[in-house]
């Protein structure tokens, strides 16, 4: 049998947020149910982890030897202290269109740990703000955004943005 | 490390121009919205210019809007402020600050860089 | 625009003392989202400046638990529970509320009595 170090070793997780609770839930993407030592895991989710507080957790399996898999769970940041927001300008609307993620509040995860995405079309671009110019008027522009914690996406958003007529003569 | 480090500070005359530069390291330059602030002889602070991380967004106080100008380059992990029309009165040690976004906190500073404006 | 009115211009005391410093806005800078962006700096001679204490009263990373942060309003106060010779040096209230009018106030010198 392998070590459960092992046989874990590159495990993954997903990290799923609850509103109400403003906790985490991670996810721990493995095939088999496991165990997970002193943190109680349910059909292999970590409940209740508070934002921006490290988490450990054994993983253990009777396919797999001692020593168990200590994974640290890097929580991310509240979801609610992000939004997606249009800074597009009103009189570039029709050939200009502005996204901006907006920290609403403060936390104390490390800022540096977070990475921002947004695909538009298939233009792909890792910043916090982006401002696509030179587009066609009166066109039907999708951008898909994500946010990412050490790498784990913990959040997402879409914009459908039309953008305005041309101005007559253009 | 996280480091900003200015340059481009000099003597020039009234009515004069002057580029300011602001070298970023050690952390994603392009997540992070960032300000100049400059300190008086008299060591008072005061917020020059502002601008959002992808340079969508520029905020001026009325007493340099019109002659001062921040912009960055996020592919060189710079920040700049150019100054024109430049008064006695905008003789100051520069700093320029980085901030998470508008509802943060000037959490690092450079070492800043001394204009004197002056005939 | 928002003035920051800070006293006094000079504080002088002994190591181990307790120290105060006030800030008063011209006016409330309770933002409409409920949160109070007021901020205090230190910048020690020769120094740039560096955060203390973020919305009223949350210590920054790093910040000795003597510096305390308190006020609401239009009202700030800075504590300093027992003054070591490392905090001698300029102390500043930022206000952040009304963006992008960011506005300093005058400062306040913590020096030996």
């Known amino acids: 049998k392998p070590t459960c170090d092992e046989k874990y070793a590159n495990i993954t997780v997903d990290y799923l947020y609850n509103k109400e609770t403003k906790l985490f839930t991670a996810k721990l993407n493995v095939n088999e149910r496991v165990e997970c030592g002193n943190n109680t895991c349910t059909n292999n989710e970590v409940h209740n982890l508070t934002e921006c507080k490290n988490a450990s957790v054994s993983i253990s399996h009777n396919s797999c030897t001692a020593p168990d898999k200590t994974l640290i769970l890097d929580v991310p940041p509240g979801v609610e202290k992000f939004q997606l927001h249009d800074c597009t300008q009103v009189e570039k609307a029709d050939t200009t269109i502005c996204l901006k993620w907006k920290n609403i509040e403060t936390f104390t995860c490390d800022t540096q740990n977070i990475t921002y995405r947004f695909q538009c079309g298939n233009m792909i671009f890792d910043n916090k703000e982006i401002k696509l110019e030179n587009l066609e008027p009166e066109h039907e522009y999708k951008c898909d955004s994500e946010i990412l914690y050490n790498n784990h996406k913990f959040t997402n958003a879409s914009k459908i943005i039309k953008t305005d007529f041309g101005s007559p003569g253009e | 490390e996280v480091q900003l480090v200015e340059s481009g500070g000099d003597l020039v005359k009234p009515g004069g121009s002057l580029k300011l530069s602001c070298a970023a390291s050690g952390f994603a330059f392009s997540n992070y919205d960032m300000s100049w602030v400059r300190q008086t002889p008299e060591k008072r602070l005061e917020w020059v210019a502002y601008i959002s991380s992808g340079g969508v967004s520029t905020y001026y106080p009325d007493t340099v809007k019109g002659r001062f100008t921040i912009s960055r380059d996020n592919a060189k992990n710079t920040l700049y402020l150019q100054m024109s029309s430049l008064k006695s009165e905008d003789t100051a040690m520069y700093y320029c600050?980085?901030?998470?976004?508008?509802?943060?906190?000037?959490?690092?500073w450079g070492a800043g860089t001394t204009v004197t404006v002056s005939s | 625009d928002v003035l920051m009115t800070q006293t006094p211009l000079s504080l002088p005391v002994s190591l181990g003392d307790q120290a105060s410093i006030s800030c008063r806005s011209s006016q409330s800078i309770v933002h409409s989202n409920g949160n109070t962006y007021l901020e205090w700096y230190l910048q020690k001679p020769g120094q740039s400046p560096k955060l203390l204490i973020y919305?009223?009263?949350n210590r920054f990373s790093g910040v000795p638990d003597r510096f305390s942060g308190s006020g609401s309003g239009t009202d700030f106060t800075l504590k300093i529970s027992r003054v070591e010779a490392e905090d001698l040096g300029v102390y500043y209230c930022f206000q952040g509320s009304h963006v992008p009018m960011y506005t300093f106030g005058g400062g306040t010198k913590l020096e030996i009595k």
């Open positions: 919305k009223v009263s």
């Open positions: 600050a980085r901030r998470y976004d508008v509802w943060w906190y000037f959490d690092v």
